[in-house]
Interface confidence: medium
């Protein structure tokens, strides 16, 4: 009775820094008792390791069992549907899950105003699951870059962009007043990882922030 159930149509990872989630699409016409078995293979150790026998969700957090991702050759995962004594064939992830698949994010962006400049400080992600020595800056130790988008409200211009090569940036506001909203998207120049825009942080700039010199 091994292959009566259809297999999950697709299986893939969606990952941020030390937040590694496996996703899959459900089988058609699944019943209330259908669940999914998840297994993991680490490159270099050519055997599948069962992670979950019966997950009723369509995703599984594999962070705890892939903590060495940033020092390994990567992983593959596979998922099959299970319903009582019946189970489907395995569906395997199409690509190797490696550090290249991790979407880069920032922790937060702190803004302050000083003498007509907006000063920004990018806080790097500090996930609780990360081992103490595995900081963002130790793993991505070179060529960190950030694209900065600034929106001015109100105003009939919105975005300015700039690539900065460190975690601090400044924007000369040239006498403009109003609310300035900032988003940051990280990248690493030597890598192909995608980056995600941070949530918008805003700060108000009024005339009181400008030093007048005669």
């Amino acid at each position: 009775h091994g292959t009566e159930l259809p297999s999950p149509p697709s299986v893939w990872f969606e990952a941020e820094f030390f937040h590694h989630i496996l996703h899959w699409t459900p089988i058609p016409n699944q019943s209330e008792s259908t669940c999914y078995e998840v297994a993991l293979l680490r490159y270099g150790i050519e055997s599948w390791n069962s992670i979950s026998n019966c997950s009723q969700t369509l995703s599984y957090d594999l962070t705890a069992v892939t903590l060495d991702l940033y020092h390994s050759n990567g992983y593959r995962a596979r998922v099959r549907a299970v319903d009582g004594s019946r189970h489907s064939n395995w569906t395997v992830t199409n690509t190797r899950f490696s550090v290249d698949e991790v979407t880069l994010t920032v922790g937060s962006v702190n803004l302050e105003i000083h003498n007509g400049f907006i000063l920004g400080k990018i806080q790097l992600p500090r996930p609780k699951m990360a081992p103490a020595n595995d900081t963002y800056e130790s793993i991505f130790s070179h060529f960190r870059e950030y694209e900065i988008a600034i929106r001015k409200v109100p105003g009939n211009f919105t975005f300015t962009h700039k690539k900065v090569k460190h975690e601090n940036f400044s924007l000369l506001t040239s006498g403009e007043v109003g609310e300035f909203c900032v988003q940051v998207k990280p990248s690493v120049a030597s890598r192909s990882n995608k980056g995600m825009w941070s949530k918008e942080e805003c700060i108000s700039l009024t005339r009181q922030y400008f030093t007048v010199t005669n």
């Epitope: 300015t160 700039k162 690539k163 400044s170 924007l171 506001t173 040239s174 403009e176």
Partner: nanobody
């Protein structure tokens, strides 16, 4: 002294694309921020987009964000404005302008910051 000459304007239908060029003579654009402004009949001149010549920074106006792209070719000393999904309200004379300096500053959103201007090229978008 920098002389600027725009080209590429014309009459197009709504939804079409157009690419404007701005060639500089007299000296290189290096060390400048260069941009595009536009002026519709009976309206004030409006900021469209700008780019630092080193390519670090681009600035876009609200009304064109996501539709227009600004770029430059250092070898040809030429600035470009790629205009997609054009709307009738994009009808205007488009001016190329250059400002000395390329720090990251909102001064480049203001026409008073630009010392050098082209003669303009007419873009008409019919519905």
């Amino acid at each position: 002294q920098v002389q600027l000459q725009e080209s590429g304007g014309g009459l197009v239908q709504a939804g079409d694309s157009l690419r404007l060029s701005c060639a500089a003579s007299g000296r290189t654009f290096s060390g400048y921020t260069v941009g595009w402004f536009r002026q519709a009949p009976g309206k004030e001149r409006e900021f469209v987009a700008a780019i630092t010549w080193n390519g670090d920074t681009t600035y876009f106006g609200d009304s064109v964000k996501g539709r227009f792209t600004i770029s430059r070719d250092s070898a040809k000393n030429t600035l470009y404005l790629e205009m997609n999904k054009l709307k009738p309200e994009d009808t205007a004379v488009y001016y190329c302008a250059a400002a000395t300096g390329q720090e990251w500053s909102l001064q480049y959103l203001r026409e008073s910051s630009y010392a050098y201007w082209g003669q303009g090229t007419q873009v008409t978008v019919s519905s």
